[in-house]
């Protein structure tokens, strides 16, 4: 079986302030088992935007029903975008581990730019 790929089909997305931004991500396989997370930025200082497994992310909704059997679409929508949300967002697959899940593969990233709200 082919190794899982993390697909972020847009290199960049531009959204007006106050609107919602949809960031698309899909996996090509259900294996390995483990959650996905969305981060803004890369490296040690990256910011967690969404964790499929746990946490409260009031501005983030998933585009498809993540609990649905065989779901491979992990796209998210972030509401009420502000200039502070600009940056590169990464969809990251983790492999289930004990005691902690282990990062398995990251998407290439989608750069979110924020336009001024139309007057």
């Amino acid at each position: 079986e082919d190794e899982l790929q993390v697909i972020q089909p847009e290199k960049s997305v531009s959204v007006a302030a106050g609107e919602s931004a949809t960031l698309r991500c899909a996996m090509t396989s259900l294996i390995p088992v483990g959650p996905i997370m969305w981060f803004r930025g890369a490296g040690a200082g990256r910011e967690l935007i969404y964790n499929q497994k746990e946490g409260h992310f009031p501005r983030v909704t998933t585009v498809s029903e993540l609990t649905k059997r065989n779901n491979l679409d992990f796209s998210i929508s972030i509401s009420n975008i502000t200039p502070a949300d600009a940056g590169t967002y990464y969809c990251v697959k983790f492999r289930k581990g004990s005691p902690d899940d282990v990062e398995f593969k990251s998407g290439a990233g989608t750069e979110l730019s924020v336009r001024a709200k139309p007057s």
Partner: antibody, heavy 121, light 113 residues
């Protein structure tokens, strides 16, 4: 080794439609986008539109919007391009081409051999 | 849409000599997030589909001979064939992939002098 295998040449009347297929032989569509690029006789390359089968969504060049429909069947690893309201200027070789979204380089790394569509009354 | 302009339209070069093709984009094809230029070069021989030679402006596709090289950044790019071989006779196209729709240059026909 993956190949993109296209359907055979077509001769069509003006005003009719044509549907061309592109099958990924020896592989799947899972981490790819499939685009359609046409080349009129002696001319350059023109992108018509593309689809990401894993998402099922297509996007089209403005020039072809409303006249072209691109679809994909993941179960058979086949993409389709249908062009309607054909006119003589649509006579061209139509290529399907693959972008490997997993690699993030976004260029067309694999091409079908092309399907010649001739529009003539 | 980003307009890609190639020059010259055609080029005749002696066997073993250098061939240089230029490509200019109407906007930068540099993607700031990864500092890559989303510019590719293709070779098309008569009756065949295009073949990817170079991507990210200067990265050779697997199996492409090292006499082919790409350079440039931003809006100005060059494809160089360091020592032209008979099998290099073809039309060469540049293409940007930084934004939709992907757009191609008009092509440069390379012939033997």
């Amino acid at each position: 080794q993956v190949q993109l295998v296209q359907s055979g040449a077509e001769v069509k009347k003006p005003g009719s439609s044509v549907k061309v297929s592109c099958k990924a032989s020896g592989g799947t569509f899972s981490s790819y986008a499939i685009s359609w690029v046409r080349q009129a006789p002696g001319q350059g390359l023109e992108w018509m539109g593309g689809i990401i089968p894993i998402f099922g969504t297509a996007n089209y060049a403005q020039k072809f919007q409303g006249r072209v429909t691109i679809t994909a069947d993941e179960s058979t690893s086949t993409a389709y391009m249908e062009l309607s309201s054909l006119r003589s200027e649509d006579t061209a070789v139509y290529y399907c081409a693959r972008q490997d979204l997993g690699s993030s380089h976004w260029h067309f790394d694999l091409w079908g051999r092309g399907t010649l569509v001739t529009v003539s009354s | 849409d980003i307009v890609m302009t190639q020059s010259p339209d055609s080029l005749a070069v002696s066997l073993g000599e250098r061939a240089t093709i230029n490509c200019k984009s109407s906007q930068s094809v540099l993607f700031s997030s990864n500092n890559k230029n989303y510019l590719a070069w293709y070779q098309q021989k008569p009756g065949q589909p295009p073949k990817l030679l170079i991507y990210w402006a200067s990265t050779r596709e697997s199996g492409v001979p090292d006499r082919f090289s790409g350079s440039g950044s931003g809006t100005d790019f060059t494809l160089t064939i360091s020592s032209l071989q008979a099998e290099d006779v073809a039309v060469y196209y540049c293409q940007q992939a930084v934004s939709d729709p992907p757009t191609f240059g008009g092509g440069t026909k390379v012939e033997i002098k």
